[in-house]
């Protein structure tokens, strides 16, 4: 559309230029042409003649009339023919919008990664709205009552900095554009408790070339967090299922995790961690792809019997794709519940 | 006690511009999420632009384009930058802490008369 024309008349819209979609809607032509009676007046839509619906009120106005007026944006202008006049004259032109009302913001979530200095708040909009839809996001003090809000368009990131007055906060999201405003809950947020820690990275693995071989995978973060739970998944690149296990890790040196796989097999390793006891986990490592090393002599292959050592693993389970065709996606099909938490809780996902 | 002192309006002509101010004391100001709203005369208020304590803002479709509000963290004041300005906004404008809401609390506000 055109942000500003010099209109010889006006142009109005019932109910209004931004309105809701699906609504009947009627435009307004009035013309104030100077040395100019005109025969016709007509309306544009993004640059097409509009043949239908069109009124003729008096002498100056006219008036088009839509039934469900769906699209979300649009251009509408209006000319006018005038005897004598080869071309038709402009009269005047409007940008017209029609969306929703916002929803509810929902799944509000807050963290701090460790060492970003921000508190990294997030929701989900619910259905697109098609006109701008800003976001309020109120960030009150529980101990000081005191109250800062933030604008955002879909997430927002507040520099701890701004928190230093105290720990436990109250954290809710207002939605707001032209046709109405709507609140997420009220989130209760401390602190202290939805840190996440410093990403873990999986540096390398090793197979040894014992009887039985055994894979080494050695995994670090620059966490300072002192108490640490971790799970590593893994899985042959061939196979739909992952296999995860638990670990209480601690940082102050590299983690060595010991399995015995399948010889002569390529397997994907990824580890996440979360602060013990806490709610927020990290996302799935990058996948990190191992080629164990080929069976040199028959035996009995059983790769749960043996111990993990160096580690306080408790439970395998398995997590498995919903089907060839969407790699990517993960569920739990045999959820084993680790100290309180689901496997597949806020996975990243890779085949 | 949260001081809001409003200055700048004054009669203009259509087409002409303003810049209003509001000076604030009595809490952390670069900490503080503001809003400017206005009341014509035998009308309810109107919320008029939000601008969060990071410098974001927000405005209402009646003044999107036209006004711009800001803040300076330095002397703890809140603007609002008027052009284009029509009849219909004449009013009194009153600042507020807050990005968005149509009330306002205390302060005595400023006149803004557009007129030819």
């Known amino acids: 559309g055109i942000t500003s024309i010099n209109c010889s008349g006006d142009m109005w819209v019932e109910p209004g230029e931004i309105f809701q979609m699906g609504m009947n809607v009627s435009i307004y032509c009035q013309e104030a042409l100077k040395h100019c009676r005109p025969r016709n007046l007509y309306f544009y839509k993004n640059g097409f003649k509009e043949e239908f619906d069109i009124t003729r009120i008096n002498r100056t106005t006219a008036r088009i009339w839509y039934k469900g007026f769906s699209e979300p944006h649009a251009y509408m202008h209006c000319t006018a023919e005038c005897p004598g006049h080869f071309q038709e004259t402009l009269i005047c032109g409007k940008d017209i919008s029609s969306g929703h009302p916002p929803d509810a913001p929902s799944n509000l979530t807050c963290v701090i990664y460790e060492y970003s200095g921000n508190m990294t708040c997030t929701w989900n909009t619910g259905k697109p709205t098609y006109i701008d839809t800003k976001y309020i996001v109120h960030v009150k003090s529980l101990e000081t009552e005191e109250e800062q809000q933030y604008l955002a368009s879909s997430y927002v990131k507040i520099s701890t900095d701004s928190l230093q007055g105290s720990r436990k906060y109250l954290v809710w999201v207002q939605a707001v554009n032209s046709l109405g405003m709507e609140n997420s809950q009220q989130l209760h947020v401390h602190l202290d408790d939805i840190v996440i820690p410093s990403a873990s990275i999986i540096s390398r693995a090793e197979t040894t070339n014992d009887t039985v071989p055994k894979t080494i995978v050695y995994w670090k973060s620059k966490t300072m967090i002192e108490k640490v739970f971790c799970e590593m998944r893994y899985k042959t690149t061939t196979n739909q299922t992952w296999s995860v296990k638990e670990f209480d890790a601690n940082f102050t040196y590299v983690q060595q995790s010991e399995f015995y796989l399948e010889p002569d097999s390529k397997y994907v390793f990824q580890v996440r961690c979360q602060e013990t006891g806490k709610r927020n986990w990290q996302p799935w490592s990058s996948p990190f792809v191992h080629q164990t090393s080929q069976e040199t002599g028959k035996r009995n292959w059983q790769p749960w019997s043996s111990p993990f050592v160096h580690q306080t693993s408790q439970t395998v389970s398995q997590v498995t794709a919903k089907s060839s065709h969407e790699p990517q996606k993960m569920e739990m099909l045999s959820a084993t519940i680790f100290r309180g938490h689901p496997a597949s809780g806020n996975h990243q996902d890779i085949g | 006690q949260v001081q809001l002192q409003e200055s700048g309006g004054g009669l203009v002509q259509p087409g002409g511009s303003l810049r209003l101010s509001c000076a604030t004391s009595?809490?952390?100001?670069?900490?503080?999420?503001m809003r400017w709203v206005r009341q014509a005369p035998g009308k309810g208020v109107e919320w008029v632009s939000g601008?969060?304590?990071?410098?974001?803002?927000i405005y209402a479709d009646s003044v999107k384009g036209r006004f711009t509000i800001s803040k300076d963290n330095a002397k703890n004041t809140l603007y609002l930058q008027m052009n284009s300005l029509k009849t219909e906004d004449t009013a009194m404008y009153y600042c507020a802490q807050g990005v968005y809401g149509d009330t306002y609390s205390g302060s005595q506000g400023t006149q803004v008369t557009v007129s030819s």
């Open positions: 009595g809490f952390t100001f670069r900490l503080t999420a």
């Open positions: 601008i969060d304590s990071a410098g974001s803002t």
